[in-house]
């Protein structure tokens, strides 16, 4: 069960995944953009769930990539209320939580579109949730790219 809150999504600025000042950091859009920007190399490995990082990346580049991703994942805790914060979790598990949260948001959005009452009190839709289908697909693809035995832990 996961859902996003908040107002209009703002693209993350730069590899640090820092969101622009003054903007709410609750939209699922930022989560996906952040993951996408930091996982460009990983998302290229669509050759199968067991595929590793492309050989064209040397060890230093991989380290930089993983460092940036760690920063991104720590930011996710502020955006995704389903992420456990009191225990260590693997990146694979984090991605699964993000996917699950977006799924909850989508379920809520779909229910609201049928009844016309977001949140149950005639509330306006506050986030660009209609784009979640594509974002879920992107997240799923990225999750499949991360090796199943990836046990790099994020605090």
């Amino acid at each position: 069960m996961k859902v996003a809150s908040g107002s209009t999504a703002t693209a993350a600025a730069g590899p640090s995944c820092a969101l622009k000042a003054g903007k709410t950091a609750s939209g699922a859009g930022e989560v996906v953009r952040c993951l996408s920007e930091q996982s460009v190399a990983i998302s290229r490995c669509a050759g199968g769930a067991g595929a590793r990082l492309p050989a064209l990346l040397d060890e230093q580049q991989v380290n930089v990539l993983l460092y940036d991703m760690n920063g991104c994942y720590s930011r996710l805790k502020e955006l995704v209320p389903t992420l456990p914060q009191n225990r260590k979790v693997s990146k694979v598990e984090i991605l699964q939580h993000v996917i699950d949260y977006i799924r909850d948001l989508q379920l809520e959005l779909n229910s609201e579109s049928e009844v016309g009452t977001p949140g149950g009190r005639g509330l306006p839709v506050r986030a660009p949730l209609s784009t979640l289908n594509g974002e879920i697909s992107a997240l799923t693809a990225e999750a499949a790219c991360v090796p199943a035995d990836d046990r790099i832990l994020c605090r």
């Epitope: 809150s5 908040g6 209320p81 456990p84 914060q85 379920l107 009190r121 506050r126």
Partner: antibody, heavy 116, light 109 residues
């Protein structure tokens, strides 16, 4: 809307099942929680059921309280080994992922009185 | 389970005044906190979620702030209708924490 039913006067030790009936949405689209409030006291979280049907309980409620989905629009709260301390109004509430899982829609509550 | 400590238990203020309610979590819940208002004989009403985001339809006189373990609900320009009991609640779904604070009764004179 959300509505609770099944509250009544029972003797200590008697099991009791409360039902939460929702309309206008499906239980598979929103997380649903149970909260209780003893007379003149504060709110006490009991447990929650996720959209996938997984259940999570407050530590004190584990083992004695069970949340289960009985249809797309009804869920039960089964309570066993009731004591006078369980006397309270029991609320069913709908969570919203878009509100960071806060409870946005509450039923009016159903009163459970445990007395000998 | 996490423990949510709410203070004060009761507070009295005049119409037009300001009331501040504090909520302390026994461990960090980042921004996963909600505030509710409850009047006698009624179920609670959501005021603020994600620690500081105002629920639609709630007057901007209500303001939530804080993160980690320390949170605050401030009600300014008090109106008679604000007289109620206010509760904080952890909404940490990731760790299955949904504990409520003990509540604060606000009396408006």
């Amino acid at each position: 809307s959300v509505e609770e039913s099944g509250g009544r006067l029972v003797s200590p030790g008697t099991p009791l099942t409360l039902t939460c009936t929702v309309s206008g949405f499906s239980l598979s689209s929103f997380p649903m929680g149970w909260v209780r409030q003893a007379p003149g006291k504060g709110l006490e979280y009991i447990g929650i059921m996720s959209t996938s049907g997984s259940t999570y309980y407050a530590d004190w409620a584990k083992g004695r309280f069970t949340i289960s989905k009985t249809s797309s629009t009804t869920m039960d709260l089964k309570m066993t080994s009731l004591t006078t301390e369980d006397t309270a109004t029991y609320f069913c509430a709908r969570g919203a992922a878009s509100r960071f899982y806060a409870f946005t829609l509450w039923g009016p509550g159903t009163l459970v009185t445990v007395s000998s | 389970d996490i423990v949510m400590t709410q203070t004060p238990a009761s507070v009295e203020a005049a119409v037009g005044g300001t009331v501040t309610i504090k909520c302390q979590a026994s461990e960090s819940i980042i921004n996963r906190l909600a505030w509710y208002q409850q009047k006698p004989g009624q179920p609670p009403k959501l005021l603020i979620y994600r620690a500081s985001t105002l629920e639609s339809g709630v007057p901007s006189r209500f303001k939530g702030s804080g993160s980690g373990t320390e949170f605050t609900l401030t009600i300014s320009d008090l109106e008679c209708d604000d007289g109620a009991t206010y509760y904080c609640q952890a909404t940490d779904y990731g760790d299955s924490y949904f504990t409520f604070g003990g509540g604060t009764e606000v009396v408006v004179k």
